[in-house]
Interface confidence: low
């Protein structure tokens, strides 16, 4: 199976109904601390604002928020672990009408309201310390 | 290992046109993506256009409509068809080459040294 450059940046157009597929793995243990982020951004650049932040602390957390006019907004954090150590994850992001729902491995994971019209996100950059084997989206 | 180089840079008036070209040296042209990013005086380095290996492209909004990029895979050639050109897309235009499609510069690994377009009102 090829993998994916990291990290790896995809135009898009986002909808409601519409699905960010993304599998990978963890490139290290989880004693050693990776971190897998995904972004949603408004503008094709890494500084513009961010409608969606999804980051795992492999092992110990996820923190999920948004940023506008480059400032980090309330943060959301799950203690809950749905990701499993040496193991391949599949992560689903659903587009729904007034939030984004997480899946990890088919499992509903986590609910997220919408802060910035999804209609505004132009690009999604998954990044960090992981192997990328499919970034997919359907619409 | 790939090298590449641009030409086709120059002066023209501001609605003329500049079409640039990126040659790649190496047999691996055909699995990277292509990239154009351009770099103002004092400016940070701006995305312009970038190209899929099969050919799928996507545009900065300040040149969508007026710039066209396009590859020869036989010919290991980027191009990009600057219309209507505007005073202020003038930079030192740069091509990139990189394993995945992207609009960040350090997701790319090779890159040319500029060609310089100066649009005159």
């Known amino acids: 199976m090829s993998l994916l450059s990291v990290p790896h940046t995809e135009s898009v157009s986002l909808s409601t109904g519409s699905t960010v597929t993304i599998k990978g793995r963890p490139l290290v243990c989880f004693l050693n601390e990776p971190h897998l982020q995904v972004d949603f951004h408004t503008e094709m650049k890494e500084d513009s604002d961010i409608a969606f932040h999804f980051q795992v602390y492999f092992g110990n957390r996820v923190v999920m928020n948004s940023r506008e006019f480059k400032i980090w907004k309330e943060e959301v954090e799950s203690k809950n672990m749905p990701f499993q150590d040496g193991q391949e994850f599949e992560l689903s992001i659903l587009v729904l009408e007034d939030k984004y729902q997480v899946m990890v491995n088919g499992q509903a994971y986590y609910n997220f309201n919408h802060r910035i019209p999804v209609s505004s996100v132009k690009m999604v950059q998954v990044w960090r310390d992981i192997s990328l084997t499919k970034f997919n989206v359907s619409n | 290992e790939l090298q590449v180089v641009e030409s086709g840079g120059g002066l023209v008036q501001a609605g003329g046109s500049l079409r640039l070209s990126c040659a790649a040296s190496?047999?691996?042209?055909?699995?990277?993506?292509m990239a154009w990013f351009r770099q103002a005086p004092g400016k940070e380095r701006e995305f312009v256009a970038a190209?899929?290996?099969?050919?799928?492209?996507t545009y900065a909004d300040s040149v969508k409509g007026r710039f066209t990029i396009s590859r020869d895979n036989a010919k290991n050639t980027v191009t990009l068809q600057m219309n209507s050109l505007k005073p202020e897309d003038t930079a030192a235009y740069h091509c990139?080459?990189?394993?995945?499609?992207?609009?960040?510069?350090?997701?790319?690994?090779?890159w040319g040294q500029g060609t310089q377009v100066t649009v005159s009102s």
């Open positions: 990139a080459a990189g394993g995945t499609y992207s609009f960040v510069p350090r997701s790319y690994n090779y």
């Open positions: 190496g047999r691996t042209f055909s699995t990277y993506s």
């Open positions: 190209i899929t290996r099969s050919g799928g492209n």
